[in-house]
C-alpha cells in the first residue's frame, strides 16, 4: 500500500518535500516515478540512480529518501502530484498528493 499526505501546502518562493511511503511484506521497490499531473518530474531507480527531467532540473532536488524536494515554488505549481512505485515481483502502486501553493505573506 501507498501512504501519503493527501493535501499539503507551501508558500510561493519556498520549497516543499513530496513524499510517498510504500509498505509490503512481499514486494521490493525497484523504481519510483514522480509526475506533476502528466509531466515527468523525476525517476528514482534502485539500480540506476536518479533522473531529473531537464525542465525541472533547477528546481527539483532528489530526496530525502525516495521523495523529492521541490524548490522556488510558484502559484502555477499548485495541483496534483503522483508517485508510482514499481516493485518486484511485479506490481505497480500509485499515490496522489495535492499541493496548494499560497501567496507569501
Amino acid at each position: 500500500t501507498i501512504d501519503t499526505k493527501r493535501n499539503i501546502s507551501a508558500e510561493e518562493g519556498g520549497s516543499v518535500i513530496l513524499q510517498c511511503h510504500f509498505s509490503s511484506d512481499t514486494a521490493e521497490v525497484t523504481q519510483v516515478d514522480w509526475k506533476q499531473q502528466d509531466q515527468l518530474l523525476a525517476i528514482y531507480s534502485v539500480d540506476l540512480g536518479w533522473h531529473v527531467a531537464s525542465v525541472f532540473s533547477d528546481r527539483v532536488v532528489p530526496g530525502p529518501s525516495l521523495g523529492l524536494t521541490f524548490q522556488s515554488l510558484t502559484m502555477n505549481d499548485t495541483g496534483e502530484y503522483f508517485c508510482t512505485y514499481h516493485t518486484y515481483p511485479g506490481g505497480i502502486y500509485k499515490g496522489r498528493i495535492f499541493l496548494k501553493v499560497q501567496e507569501s505573506s
Epitope: 521490493e28 525497484t30 523504481q31 516515478d33 515527468l40 525517476i43 531507480s45 534502485v46 539500480d47 540506476l48 540512480g49 536518479w50 533522473h51 527531467a53 514499481h86 516493485t87 518486484y88 515481483p89 511485479g90 505497480i92
Partner: antibody, heavy 125, light 107 residues
Framework: QLQLQESGPGLVKPSETLSLTCTVS??????????WAWIRQPPGKGLEWIGS???????YYNPSLKSRVTISVDTSKNQFSLKLSSVTATDTAVYYC?????????????????WGQGTMVTVSS | EIVMTQSPATLSVSPGERATLSCRAS??????LAWYQQKPGQAPRLLIY???TRATGIPARFSGSGSGTEFTLTISSLQSEDFAVYYC?????????FGGGTKVEIK
C-alpha cells in the same frame, strides 16, 4: 561504448544445466550503473526476457523461468553469467546478453541499449 | 504481467512507401515503450525509446508515437535496409515483455 560478447557451449544435454558468460569490454562492470540482462530467441520465434541483475546485486527473473534461472556478476573478470537448470529441447535458442538503462540518468528511459551478437545453444542428447 | 500484442504479423510494403506498425499493451505503460529492429542473423537494435525518441544514430524516417496502451512505429519511406522484423517492448514494470514482432517484407 561498451561491448558485449557471449560465450559457452553450443550443445547441452537434456536435464543438464546451461551455462553462459557475457564478457564486457570498453568499461568496468563494477563502476557502471546498469541492468545486465539475458534474453533468448528460439529458432524462428520472438524475443523472451530471461532476467536481469542490477548494480544493487538484486536479481529479477521471468516468472516462467524463475525456478531454473540464476544470473550473477563477476566483477574481477568483468563478466556476468547465466545458469539455466534442467533444460529441455524447448530451451534451444539464440541467447543474447544485453545492457539495460545505459542512458537512464540522462534521458530517464530503461531499454536494452546494447546487445551482444548472440550465441546459439541447442539442447539435444 | 503486461502482454504486448503487435499487428500485423507481416506487412508487405514497396520500397519508398510508408509502413505503420502497431503495438498494444494489456494495461497502461505510460510512455515506457521501446522499439527494436532485427535483421536475419543479427542481434536486435534499439530504434525508439520513451515511445517517441529515436536512439543514437537512428534515421529520421523512423518515428514512434502513442502512450498508455496504444503505440505506433512509422517508417516514412522504406529503404531496402529497413526490411526486417520489428519488436516492441515495455519497461520498467517487471517482468520485461516483448511483442511477438512484425515482419516488414518487400511487396
Amino acid at each position: 561504448q561498451l561491448q558485449l560478447q557471449e560465450s559457452g557451449p553450443g550443445l547441452v544435454k537434456p536435464s543438464e544445466t546451461l551455462s553462459l558468460t557475457c564478457t564486457v569490454s570498453g568499461g568496468s562492470i563494477s563502476s557502471s550503473r546498469y541492468y545486465w540482462a539475458w534474453i533468448r530467441q528460439p529458432p524462428g520465434k520472438g524475443l523472451e526476457w530471461i532476467g536481469s541483475i542490477g548494480t544493487s546485486g538484486s536479481t529479477y527473473y521471468n516468472p516462467s523461468l524463475k525456478s531454473r534461472v540464476t544470473i550473477s556478476v563477476d566483477t574481477s573478470k568483468n563478466q556476468f553469467s547465466l545458469k539455466l537448470s534442467s533444460v529441455t529441447a524447448t530451451d534451444t535458442a539464440v541467447y543474447y546478453c544485453a545492457i539495460e538503462g545505459a542512458n537512464f540518468r540522462d534521458f530517464g528511459y530503461v531499454a536494452f541499449d546494447i546487445w551482444g551478437q548472440g550465441t546459439m545453444v541447442t539442447v539435444s542428447s | 504481467e503486461i502482454v504486448m500484442t503487435q499487428s500485423p504479423a507481416t506487412l508487405s510494403v514497396s520500397p519508398g512507401e510508408r509502413a505503420t506498425l502497431s503495438c498494444r499493451a494489456s494495461q497502461s505503460v505510460s510512455s515506457n515503450l521501446a522499439w527494436y529492429q532485427q535483421k536475419p542473423g543479427q542481434a536486435p537494435r534499439l530504434l525508439i525509446y520513451g515511445a517517441s525518441t529515436r536512439a543514437t544514430g537512428i534515421p529520421a524516417r523512423f518515428s514512434g508515437s502513442g502512450s498508455g496502451t496504444e503505440f505506433t512505429l512509422t517508417i516514412s519511406s522504406l529503404q531496402s535496409e529497413d526490411f526486417a522484423v520489428y519488436y516492441c517492448q515495455q519497461s520498467p514494470p517487471w517482468p520485461r515483455t516483448f511483442g511477438g514482432g512484425t515482419k516488414v517484407e518487400i511487396k
